[in-house]
C-alpha cells in the first residue's frame, strides 16, 4: 500500500539533488585552492542532516549550523556585491571582476543556487514530488531558511563600501520584500560599513532617466541613512557596455558614462 505523502504547493526537490550538491562541491574546491581542504562528503552529510527526517515547515537556522561551519571561507569583506532581481548580470560581473563576490560565489551559495530541496518528517526520504511554498504553505521551509541564514550572515560579514545591483526595469527597483530589502539591508553593520552604493541597471536602450531619483531608491536611502550608513547611487544606462568596460577598462569608449 503506498504511503500517504503530504502534498505541498511548491515544486519538489530538484532531481539528482544529492549528486548535484556533491558534484558542485567537488568542482568548487577544485577551482578555489583555498577550499581544497573541504571534505565534500562531510559537506553533503551536513546539508542532508539539515532537512532529512524533519518536518519541512519546521526548519531552523540551527539545523544548518553544521553546514555553515564546514562552509567557512575567507570572503573579502570589502569586496561584497549584493543584488536584487538581477542575479544573472551580478554573476556575469563577478565572473569578470574576480576579486568581487556575490553570495553565489561562496561555497554555500554555489552549492544551493537555483536548487529546491525538502524532506519528510520521520522518514529518511527526500521529497521529489513537492516542497512547501513560502507564501502558500510556510516560511520555515528548508530552502527559505537556508537563504535567509546565509544572506543574513553575508550582509553581517560586509565592510567598508558594499555594492548592490538593482533592476531598474522593475516597478519596485528597491523592494522591501526581497531578500535584499528584508534581510540584507537590515543586517549591514554600521560600525563596519561606511557606504552602500547602489547600481541601478537600466533595461531600455534609450532610457536616460535618472533612476536614482526613483521613490523606492529614496526609500532605500532613508532606511540606510537611518542606520548611520552613507548611501550613494549610480545609473548603469548600458549594462552591456558596463560589462565590456569591466573587461577592458582601457577602451577609449569607457571614459564616458555607462
Amino acid at each position: 500500500v503506498p504511503r500517504w505523502r503530504q502534498q505541498w504547493s511548491g515544486p519538489g526537490t530538484t532531481k539528482r539533488f544529492p549528486e548535484t550538491v556533491l558534484a558542485r562541491c567537488v568542482k568548487y574546491t577544485e577551482i578555489h585552492p583555498e577550499m581544497r581542504h573541504v571534505d565534500c562528503q562531510s559537506v553533503w552529510d551536513a546539508f542532508k542532516g539539515a532537512f532529512i527526517s524533519k518536518h519541512p515547515c519546521n526548519i531552523t537556522e540551527e539545523d544548518y549550523q553544521p553546514l555553515m561551519k564546514l562552509g567557512t571561507q575567507t570572503v573579502p569583506c570589502n569586496k561584497i556585491l549584493l543584488w536584487s532581481r538581477i542575479k544573472d548580470l551580478a554573476h556575469q560581473f563577478t565572473q569578470v571582476q574576480r576579486d568581487m563576490f556575490t553570495l553565489e560565489d561562496t561555497l554555500l551559495g554555489y552549492l544551493a543556487d537555483d536548487l529546491t530541496w525538502c524532506g519528510e518528517f520521520n522518514t529518511s526520504k527526500i521529497n521529489y514530488q513537492s516542497c512547501p511554498d513560502w507564501r502558500k504553505d510556510c516560511s520555515n521551509n528548508p530552502v527559505s531558511v537556508f537563504w535567509k541564514t546565509v544572506s543574513r550572515r553575508f550582509a553581517e560579514a560586509a565592510c567598508d563600501v558594499v555594492h548592490v545591483m538593482l533592476n531598474g526595469s522593475r516597478s519596485k527597483i528597491f523592494d522591501k520584500n526581497s531578500t535584499f530589502g528584508s534581510v540584507e539591508v537590515h543586517n549591514l553593520q554600521p560600525e563596519k560599513v561606511q557606504t552602500l552604493e547602489a547600481w541601478v541597471i537600466h533595461g531600455g536602450r534609450e532610457d536616460s532617466r535618472d533612476l536614482c531619483q526613483d521613490p523606492t531608491i529614496k526609500e532605500l536611502e532613508s532606511i540606510i541613512s537611518k542606520r548611520n550608513i552613507q548611501f550613494s547611487c549610480k545609473n548603469i544606462y548600458r549594462p552591456d557596455k558596463f560589462l565590456q568596460c569591466v573587461k577592458n577598462p582601457e577602451d577609449s569608449s569607457c571614459t564616458s558614462e555607462i
Partner: nanobody, 116 residues
Framework: QVQLVESGGGLVQAGGSLRLACTAS????????MNWYRQAPGSPRELVAT???????TYADSAKGRFTVATDNAKATAYLQLTSLTPEDTGVYYC??????????WGQGTQVTVSS
C-alpha cells in the same frame, strides 16, 4: 585555517602605555574585519576596538581617546596601542576574526595588568 597570536602584554603602572600585537597566519587583515576584546577578571569578554581593511575604526566608550587600533598588512599584524591605562583596563586581551558565514577565530590572549 586562521591562527592568531597575541603579544605585548605585561605589568604596567597606572597612566602607562603598552602596545599589543596580533600576528595572523596569512594576510587576513587585508580582507577581514579585526576585533580586539578584553576579558576582565570575573567578567565576560567585551569588544574594545574594531578595524576594517579600509581602515574604518570603532571603539568601546571606555577605549575612546586612549586606545588606537591599526594594522600592518605587510607584517600580517594588527596592533592595539593602550595609553593612559587605569586598573580597570586590567584583563586578558584577545584578537578575533570572524569568517563567513560565522566561524570565530581567537588568539590565545595576552595578559595586561595595571597597578595603581
Amino acid at each position: 585555517q586562521v591562527q592568531l597570536v597575541e603579544s605585548g602584554g605585561g605589568l604596567v603602572q597606572a597612566g602607562g602605555s603598552l602596545r599589543l600585537a596580533c600576528t595572523a597566519s596569512g594576510n587576513i587583515f587585508a580582507s577581514q574585519v579585526m576585533n580586539w576584546y578584553r576579558q576582565a577578571p570575573g567578567s565576560p569578554r567585551e569588544l574594545v576596538a574594531t578595524i576594517t581593511p579600509g581602515g574604518r575604526t570603532t571603539y568601546a566608550d571606555s577605549a575612546k581617546g586612549r586606545f588606537t587600533v591599526a594594522t600592518d598588512n605587510a607584517k600580517a599584524t594588527a596592533y592595539l596601542q593602550l595609553t593612559s591605562l587605569t586598573p580597570e583596563d586590567t584583563g586578558v586581551y584577545y584578537c578575533h576574526v570572524r569568517l563567513f558565514p560565522a566561524t570565530d577565530y581567537w588568539g590565545q590572549g595576552t595578559q595586561v595588568t595595571v597597578s595603581s
